[in-house]
């Protein structure tokens, strides 16, 4: 390595380019400066993302993949660096950018929201799971009436265009449904969604957004909820939701509502059963909901509550109609 009294001048990388390699994905590439003397030192590169969101990182190789929204444009810089116990040196920056795509901002969609849901694949002999995707949006305030929007998603290396749209009264696409996708429900990749558009009257600005699966995955409610009363013991059991996550990956909430006095008990659990001490004069309705535990994935959404189950004394039964 460089000694404290040695001097080396660092030169910026050359041929720095940004290539769009997929939906919301770019490849940054550069070459070492051919005039850079190496002198047995460990040179690295510092990549700085300037826009749309500031970030930086180091790498020893001459390319870098970046997952990022592109509808606001994209700008990055790279420089050669040398950092050790007695040196801190950096070259000037080499920079490149992608301009924002054409079309005024008001023509692009707004309020894009997406949710995923898991179903069991009944066509397969092995237990496997399918992930559906549903997205909705609002038409841009400056979009001409003849605007038509088109949605695409990318997950990993898979990109698909929507085939099933819902439309507004003017026939413009405002929602999309993929019954089956290439999304892996236990995956940790970003889900990239792009909505572009066309109009005879003006350019329509595309809009892309990145979603973390844990934040949009609508967990199914627990299955086969049962409740029994033995004396003053209310025993509740259930099965894990339809999900690619295994049994140990769920947190549960049990809601016990005493319909006689209105008292509501909510318990948070990590097991598939719960016993509560109750009075045997009341009627109860019981519901359970689930969420993927933070042991298995970042905190996300709770499922809907399961359908209520009614147990207990039913003195005030409505008269049965004959």
């Amino acid at each position: 390595d460089l000694l404290p009294d040695e001097k080396i001048s660092l030169l910026p990388p050359v041929n720095f380019t940004i290539k769009v390699t997929g939906l919301a994905q770019v490849l940054l590439q550069w070459k070492p400066n051919p005039d850079q003397e190496q002198r047995n030192v460990n040179l690295e590169y510092q990549v700085k993302i300037n826009a749309p969101k500031e970030d930086d990182y180091e790498t020893r190789i001459t390319e870098s993949k970046c997952v990022t929204i592109l509808h606001k444009g994209f700008s990055a810089s790279v420089r050669t660096i040398l950092q050790n116990d007695h040196s801190l040196l950096a070259s000037s920056w080499a920079s490149a950018e992608l301009h924002a795509p054409p079309g005024s901002p008001g023509t692009s969609i707004v309020n894009l929201t997406c949710t995923t849901n898991t179903t069991e694949d009944n066509y397969s002999r092995l237990r496997s799971y399918q992930v559906s995707l549903h997205c909705t949006w609002l038409v841009g305030t400056d979009a001409p009436e003849d605007t038509q929007y088109f949605l695409y998603y990318r997950y990993g290396s898979w990109t698909e265009e929507c085939q099933e749209y819902s439309k507004d009264t003017l026939g413009r696409n405002i929602a999309c449904w993929f019954p089956r996708t290439f999304i892996l429900s236990k995956g940790r990749d970003w889900l990239a969604v792009l909505v572009n558009g066309s109009s005879k009257h003006s350019a329509i600005r595309p809009f892309d957004q990145l979603f973390a699966l844990h934040a949009i995955d609508q967990i199914n409610p627990p299955l086969n909820v049962t409740a029994e009363i033995e004396g003053t013991r209310l025993s509740i059991q259930w099965e894990k939701p339809v999900s690619a996550f295994p049994i140990h990956c769920f947190d549960y909430e049990v809601k016990i509502h005493n319909t006689r006095n209105g008292y509501l008990q909510i318990e948070k659990l990590m097991t598939n059963a719960f016993i509560s001490i109750i009075d045997d004069l009341s009627k109860y309705d019981v519901q359970v909901r689930a969420a993927v535990s933070s042991m298995c994935r970042e905190a996300g959404l709770w499922s809907e509550w399961s359908q209520p189950i009614y147990v207990g004394n039913d003195e005030h039964k409505p008269l049965r109609e004959w």
Epitope: Q46, K48, K53, E54, D55, D56, Q83, S87, L88, A90
Partner: antibody, heavy 118, light 107 residues
């Protein structure tokens, strides 16, 4: 050797202003981001803000925007923190810190103790 | 702003004991960084980008985590490890925030 040398301790009256300095040796500050961090007695660390000395761009915690002004002079390789309208709440050790990266702090000065007292 | 909560606030360990301290973020962060500070001295960069050891940091230290949950572990406590450890996150929208610190004492 890479070093950050901060100015000496300050005792100032409430309502006054103070200018703290941090001079780098062993590197050019224009190659780095220079940050200022506050530590009140027996307390944790609070980020005040940063400057990119190459272009003068600054970013700071909104909480300190009315209180602190960060500047840099690349010719003297020095970063500055100016604190105004001082109160006893500003009594603290102020560290200058910086490095090549935005995300974290490679090098730290020895700290400047500021005491605000009448 | 992202709030970092360190636990425990104070802990003590015997020489040779394994030590783990945690840092919990109020929302997801990409990386966590850790600093060691001994009384009356400046903080030192200790672990950066979640798991990389700064120059000169003994190999008994390690860092791990993702999302909202991060930790610093010492595989075998030594007397020189007694210090306060701060976690720190960076997000592209200021501010940078630190945890409240974990003070590690030797038994």
């Amino acid at each position: 050797e890479v070093q950050l040398q901060q100015s000496g301790a300050e005792l100032v009256k409430p309502g006054a202003s103070v200018n703290l300095s941090c001079t780098a040796s062993g590197f050019n500050i224009k190659d780095t981001y220079m940050h200022w961090v506050k530590q009140r007695p027996e307390q944790g660390l609070e980020w005040i803000g940063r400057i990119d000395p190459a272009n003068g761009n600054t970013k700071s915690d909104p909480k300190f925007q009315a209180k602190a002004t960060i500047a840099a002079d690349t010719s003297s390789n020095t970063a500055y923190l100016q604190l105004s309208s001082l109160t006893s709440e500003d009594t603290a050790v102020y560290y200058c810190t910086g490095g090549l990266r935005l995300r974290f702090f490679d090098y730290w000065g020895q700290g400047t103790t500021l005491t605000v007292s009448s | 702003q992202i709030v970092l909560t360190q636990s425990p606030a104070i802990m003590s360990a015997s020489p040779g004991e394994k030590v783990t301290m945690t840092c919990s973020a109020s929302s997801s962060v990409s990386y966590m960084h850790w600093y060691q500070q001994k009384s009356g001295t400046s903080p030192k960069r200790w672990i950066y980008d979640t798991s990389k050891l700064a120059s000169g940091v003994p190999a008994r230290f390690s860092g791990s985590g993702s999302g909202t949950s991060y930790s610093l572990t010492i595989s075998s406590m030594e007397a020189e490890d007694a210090a306060t450890y701060y976690c720190q996150q960076w997000s592209s929208n200021p501010p940078i925030t630190f945890g409240g610190g974990t003070k590690l004492e030797i038994k």
